[in-house]
Amino acid sequence: TSSASSSSSSAPFLASAASAQPPLPDQCPALCECSEAARTVKCVNRNLTEVPTDLPLYVRNLFLTGNQLAVLPAGAFARRPPLAELAALNLSGSRLDEVRGGAFEHLPSLRQLDLSHNPLAYLSPFAFSGSNASISAPSPLVELILNHIVPPDDKRQNRSFEGMVAAALVAGRALQGLHLLELASNHFLYLPRDVLAQLPSLRYLDLSNNSLVSLTYVSFRNLTHLESLHLEDNALKVLHNGTLAELQGLPHVRVFLDNNPWVCDCHMADMVTWLKQTGVVQGKDRLTCAFPEKMRNRVLLELNSADLDCDPILPPSLQTS
């Protein structure tokens, strides 16, 4: 194999290559701005096609935004000696469409990772766990920001995008220590069933601006530390009793439900009753009906059971087209 002046031998990409001499511990790569005092390196909007090879060992905050990285191979940040201080890595808006397994290996202090605004056609199940073991070493990640990572329709693969993201989140149970997960603006139609069960430490979950229609099969029960749940700007029609009870049972949670197309028919009665007595929902007085037409813009908190009726289902012989 080729080898990297700054790589680990277990990482297929950088294990096989790097600079001729080990980097000076405080040198700043070309096209980057470095502050040793702030432990920060910014290589922003420079059309980089690869992660810089010779990053200073002091780097704690690394900004690689607005580039053209396309692919993050295994060991993309592996260096010898390792970037042991790197705690915050921002790769947003860098035209990534492929993140391979082990891309973030050998970053022992990595707490915050932002991959937002990259059209991820391929996100390896082992992107965050680094290994295909059923139980991997715990990831140090505490905050994972994956807003607007959905690829355009013509780049989406046959498998579901939701499933691909979910597989990366649960692989090896590596993200058990994750406190913050942002998944806004990803066109999610559903939340895969077992994802949240594998993320028991979550305090902040942002699912806003997706296309979630229902939470029927989602369990929030074990998210006992959850403080903020953002479900604004989805396609939610109603929350059913099971979901309402689970949310009510979370001791610290605040739920945000604005801008959903609530259907104010007989199925909404339990939710309206719950809204009137719960302190869980922030801005609950802003929630309004979208359907049926006669109920549009009515405030949910002002409804009573008489308002919430369902049209009787006509027998087929009486239905008209």
Epitope: T1, S2, A4, P12, F13, L14, S16, A17, A18, S19, A20, P29, A30, L31, C32, C43, R46, N47, L48, T49, E50, V51, P52, T53, D54, Q68, A70, V71, P73, A74, D97, E98, R100, A121, Y122, K155, Q157
Partner: antibody, heavy 120, light 111 residues
Framework: EVQLVESGGGVVQPGRSLRLSCAAS????????MHWVRQAPGKGLEWVAY????????YYADTVKGRFTISRDNSKNTLYLQMNSLRAEDTAVYYC?????????????WGQGTTVTVSS | DIVLTQTPLSLSVTPGQPASISCRAS??????????LHWYLQKPGQPPQLLIK???NLESGVPDRFSGSGSGTDFTLKISRVEAEDVGVYYC?????????FGQGTKLEIK
């Protein structure tokens, strides 16, 4: 027309040094990554080294790591390969080649090559 | 390192007849978003020239009698009707990871 012209080859004794150059024209040199690829007499192609467009990334084959250094001067549209501690097995035609990126790229333009002979 | 194995190592083809070269990788060089396998022709006394990028995309200026196919580990370069100017050595090359490697080459001769 894209042109890459290598120079600096020659006959050199083992253990000595040589510096190859590659002069680029006909395209915006500073927008492209560059490689060195070599071909030993009668043999196939071997990738040697890569440098990114802005000199932020450098990669080497194991066979040359620690002995060769790739560099570039975008103001002069020139790519370099500093070869130290030369060995007989470094004898080859050395080509410079252009790419748009390392992994997503390919060698879409090649120079004619310069011959390096390491012999005592 | 990824090893690329080309077959055959040489072939002799009558002008106007088709030709096919195989390249097998020791591990997959495809992802769902890109195929990291390219083909080159090195004519006698010349540097290599790019024929096919990303397994199947014809480089500008290359005659359309050349075509490429494949994904994962198995790839094929085809020439629908060989012409005299097609003689030389054909190489496949991957860009999946460092080091980039080439196949050992396939020498095409005209009968």
């Amino acid at each position: 027309e894209v042109q890459l012209v290598e120079s600096g080859g020659g006959v050199v004794q083992p253990g000595r040094s040589l510096r190859l150059s590659c002069a680029a024209s006909g395209f915006t040199f500073s927008n492209f990554g560059m490689h060195w690829v070599r071909q030993a007499p009668g043999k196939g192609l071997e990738w040697v080294a890569y440098i990114s467009s802005g000199s932020t990334s450098f990669y080497y084959a194991d066979t040359v790591k620690g002995r060769f250094t790739i560099s570039r001067d975008n103001s002069k549209n020139t790519l370099y390969l500093q070869m130290n501690s030369l060995r007989a097995e470094d004898t080859a035609v050395y080509y410079c080649a252009r790419t748009n990126s390392l992994l997503r790229g390919f060698f879409d333009a090649w120079g004619q090559g310069t011959t390096v002979t390491v012999s005592s | 390192d990824i090893v690329l194995t080309q077959t055959p190592l040489s072939l002799s083809v009558t002008p106007g007849q088709p030709a096919s070269i195989s390249c097998r990788a020791s591990q997959s060089v495809s992802s769902s978003s890109y195929t990291y396998l390219h083909w080159y022709l090195q004519k006698p006394g010349q540097p290599p020239q790019l024929l096919i990028k990303s397994a199947s995309n014809l480089e500008s200026g290359v005659p359309d009698r050349f075509s490429g196919s494949g994904s994962g580990t198995d790839f094929t370069l085809k020439i629908s009707r060989v012409e005299a100017e097609d003689v030389g050595v054909y190489y496949c090359q991957h860009s999946w990871e460092i080091p980039l490697t080439f196949g050992q080459g396939t020498k095409l001769e005209i009968k």
